[in-house]
Amino acid sequence: PEPPTACREKQYLINSQCCSLCQPGQKLVSDCTEFTETECLPCGESEFLDTWNRETHCHQHKYCDPNLGLRVQQKGTSETDTICTCEEGWHCTSEACESCVLHRSCSPGFGVKQIATGVSDTICEPCPVGFFSNVSSAFEKCHPWTSCETKDLVVQQAGTNKTDVVCGPQDRLRA
């Protein structure tokens, strides 16, 4: 018979032969042959593999570093990675939760809609037309553009969501 060019699900092609993949939680020791099945071994303590695989090494469980404010939310198994979270009152910097911050800041162009609490992080909102924020802040709202008219001045440079308007003197030359 012709050697296969593709294999079924949970199999892989090697040496013109379809071998079974190792199940999650196990790593590959040796490929199958005409006469033997794929040989797999369970991952060791603090290791995991979360898919059907042909990996020769298991992945290390994530370390929740207490020096970064992290603690274990869910202990890893041979099939799943450890899930970290932040100490109470702190917030993850990303979905992967690799480090913790007291609260995040709102970037220039955004203002603080709600200041962080122990439970919820800072909520930012974009500065609407007529407002700006030129700083990164965890408490400052968007500021309204300066009203040149009330100072008997004119707008020399338009404002943006990150910059205030620039006012200048009225043009004295009037027709």
Partner: nanobody, 116 residues
Framework: EVQLLESGGGLVQPGGSLRLSCAAS???????EMWWVRQAPGKGLERVS?????????YYADSVKGRFTISRDDSKNTLYLQMNSLRAEDTAVYYC?????????WGQGTLVTVSS
């Protein structure tokens, strides 16, 4: 290496005053937004007060409004918290924090105990 060193805490009677200081080193202090945060025994973190990098904007939690004043002296790389009319519920460890507020730049804090 960023270092924040809080001082000025102690035992004070209700109605009394204290001035906390936070000495900053390892970064250019001027221009950084700064916060005072506290943690009462067995409680979570409470954001007390903040000051903008320019010193022009401030924030106070409702629980301290009218009693506490935040200020900064950029020439001394120091943040202050003047606490007046202290109450028993102000008892806590007080920490200062700098943007971006990472855990590893957290100081040791200074303990304020308000008791008669």
């Amino acid at each position: 290496e960023v270092q924040l060193l809080e001082s000025g805490g102690g035992l004070v009677q209700p109605g009394g005053s204290l001035r906390l200081s936070c000495a900053a080193s390892g970064f250019t202090f001027a221009g950084y937004e700064m916060w005072w945060v506290r943690q009462a025994p067995g409680k979570g973190l409470e954001r007390v007060s903040a000051i903008s990098g320019s010193g022009g904007s401030t924030y106070y939690a409702d629980s301290v409004k009218g009693r506490f004043t935040i200020s900064r002296d950029d020439s001394k790389n120091t943040l202050y918290l003047q606490m007046n009319s202290l109450r028993a519920e102000d008892t806590a460890v007080y920490y200062c924090a700098k943007e971006p507020y990472s855990f590893d730049s957290w100081g040791q804090g200074t303990l304020v105990t308000v008791s008669s």
